[in-house]
Interface confidence: low
């Protein structure tokens, strides 16, 4: 009689993560008598997957009834497959021996490849805010997918970006892979409502790509513009001066009024108005008692926005002149060195 052969008809099997893998194995003879075992990997360090004779293998079921005397089908099913199950599986026939069974013949092996979906892309932006005209980097990461082939695209408000670099790791063969991409985005003053989107397409997603988003509102800082104006007289000896703080983002802002360099009042922006582009406007006013001053008064509106160096604008109030409305442009001056720090 011809010697027993162990036949594994499938050179490779492809299974989606979470599904059940069927690994086929048949023997050509009932002789010699002895159990079958399944291993992952070859050599002495191989991993036992199933032992017909003994042991508990909760994820493994046999296709046919191995207790029947004439059974020659040793196929198994492995449930709830994960990428970690990838590898080459060998169906091995043992010959009854004393005290231990002896390996008699092995099948050629079946390579199990696992198709696994990528995780939801996670997009992260820079740690610190940046101002318009600056270029910032966003990263996108997705993990755990297999096979290796994957497509990643970047969008800003629906427009596809071209300035990005993508790596899929590891470079060689693996049970699963990760993708990491870095995109460069130029900020504009209108980007408070903008979104950056990372889109990942993979064979397991069946044409329905995964998306990760980042709101540029978390990244952008739009510095304010200041305008100081003198309002009409309220009383004979009182002047109302306003400081208009326009087009700033985020809202975190503190304003200090200085009279001739001395702090008069400090307040935090609260009841702001929002512009269509997502930036904010705010106004603060100061009532100045002119009769309390002998000389001209230099009023300064100093704004500290989002923890940045202060920017300020000044207005000269002429005490000698009759307190009527004065235009801000003639008397206003800019502390340019501070402004340079913020922009």
């Amino acid at each position: 009689e011809e010697e027993l052969q162990v036949i594994q008809p499938d050179k490779s099997v492809l299974v989606a993560a979470g599904e059940t893998a069927t690994l086929r194995c048949t023997a050509t003879s009932l002789i010699p008598v002895g159990p079958i075992q399944w291993f992952r990997g070859a050599g002495p360090g191989r991993e036992l997957i199933y032992n017909q004779k003994e042991g508990h293998f909760p994820r493994v079921t046999t296709v046919s009834d191995l207790t029947k005397r004439n059974n020659m089908d040793f196929s198994i099913r492995i449930g709830n497959i994960t990428p970690a199950d990838a590898g080459t599986y060998y169906c091995v026939k043992f010959r009854k021996g004393s005290p231990d069974d002896v390996e008699f013949k092995s099948g050629a092996g079946t390579e199990l490849s696992v198709r696994a979906k990528p995780s939801a892309p996670v997009v992260s932006g820079p740690a610190a805010r940046a101002t318009p005209q600056h270029t910032v980097s966003f990263t996108c990461e997705s993990h755990g997918f297999s096979p290796r082939d994957i497509t990643l695209k970047w969008f800003k408000n629906g427009n596809e970006l071209s300035d990005f670099q993508t790596n899929v790791d590891p470079v060689g063969e693996s049970v699963s892979y990760s993708i990491h991409s870095t995109a460069k985005v130029v900020l504009t003053r209108e980007d408070v409502h903008s979104q950056v989107i990372c889109e990942v397409a993979h064979v397991t997603l069946q044409g329905d790509p995964l998306r990760g988003t980042a709101n540029l509102s978390e990244t952008i800082r739009v510095p304010p513009t200041l305008e100081v104006t003198q309002q009409p007289v309220r009383a004979e000896n009182q002047v109302n001066v306003t400081c208009q703080v326009r087009k700033f983002y985020p809202q975190r802002l503190q304003l200090t009024w200085l009279e001739n360099g001395n702090v008069s009042r400090t307040e935090t922006a609260s009841t702001v108005t929002e512009n269509k582009d997502g930036t904010y406007n705010w106004m603060s006013w100061l009532l100045v008692n002119v009769s309390a001053h002998r000389d001209d008064v230099k009023l300064t509106c100093q704004v500290e926005h989002d923890g940045q160096p202060a920017v300020s604008k000044s207005h000269d109030l002429k005490v000698s002149a009759h307190p009527k409305e004065q235009g801000s442009n003639t008397a206003a001056e800019n502390t340019g060195s501070n402004e340079r720090n913020i922009y």
Epitope: A42, G43, P44, R46, G87, E103, S106, P170, E173
Partner: antibody, heavy 122, light 107 residues
Framework: EVQLVESGGGVVQPGRSLRLSCAAS????????MSWVRQAPGKGLEWVAS????????YYADSAKGRFTISRDNSKNTLYLQMNSLRAEDTAVYYC???????????????WGQGTLVTVSS | DIQMTQSPSSVSASVGDRVTITCRAS??????LAWYQQKPGKAPKLLIY???SLQSGVPSRFSGSGSGTDFTLTISSLQPEDFATYYC?????????FGGGTKVEIK
Amino acid sequence: EVQLVESGGGVVQPGRSLRLSCAASGFTFSYYGMSWVRQAPGKGLEWVASIWVDGSNKYYADSAKGRFTISRDNSKNTLYLQMNSLRAEDTAVYYCAEGKETYSGPNWFDPWGQGTLVTVSS
Amino acid sequence: DIQMTQSPSSVSASVGDRVTITCRASQGISSWLAWYQQKPGKAPKLLIYAASSLQSGVPSRFSGSGSGTDFTLTISSLQPEDFATYYCQQAIYFPITFGGGTKVEIK
């Protein structure tokens, strides 16, 4: 190109220690079981030790047990063999070798490094 | 431990000859056997694994056969570059063991 380069060999007195290194390149080191095999001058090949892909399992020949330690640093793509209490009979060329199959224990060895000579002599 | 016994320990042959080397395991190892070639001063090179599978890049004049305890390496037509020492190795049980080697010399 797949390359394994051993280093750390030399002349050492009996009872002393030596640490061999094997730098791997050209393949993804962390997917393969690795082994050390030695060859005494004019003699045949003798398996010394093997290590699983993630270092979780280590295997030793009887002649190495208790004296030699195999380890690996996958972040540095390097295999090590720490040899303590060296004896004259440990004199040999020591080869590092890669297991042929990914995610497997040591089985067939391919490729091999060029070897490093360890001479234990007083 | 599984003992691997190679025979002959040396063989003299001419270019073009058919050379057969045998390897016997002290107990059954199924098909878990490899053959290596080693030239003086060089590292061993894998020729055959799983008893009969030819390693990539190895000339087809090399072939392996056998299962269980008895295995054979055959060089169908010896070439000048084939003069070397050949080793068998069992790859199923620890400790991994090699045969003593067969030196193929020029006649």
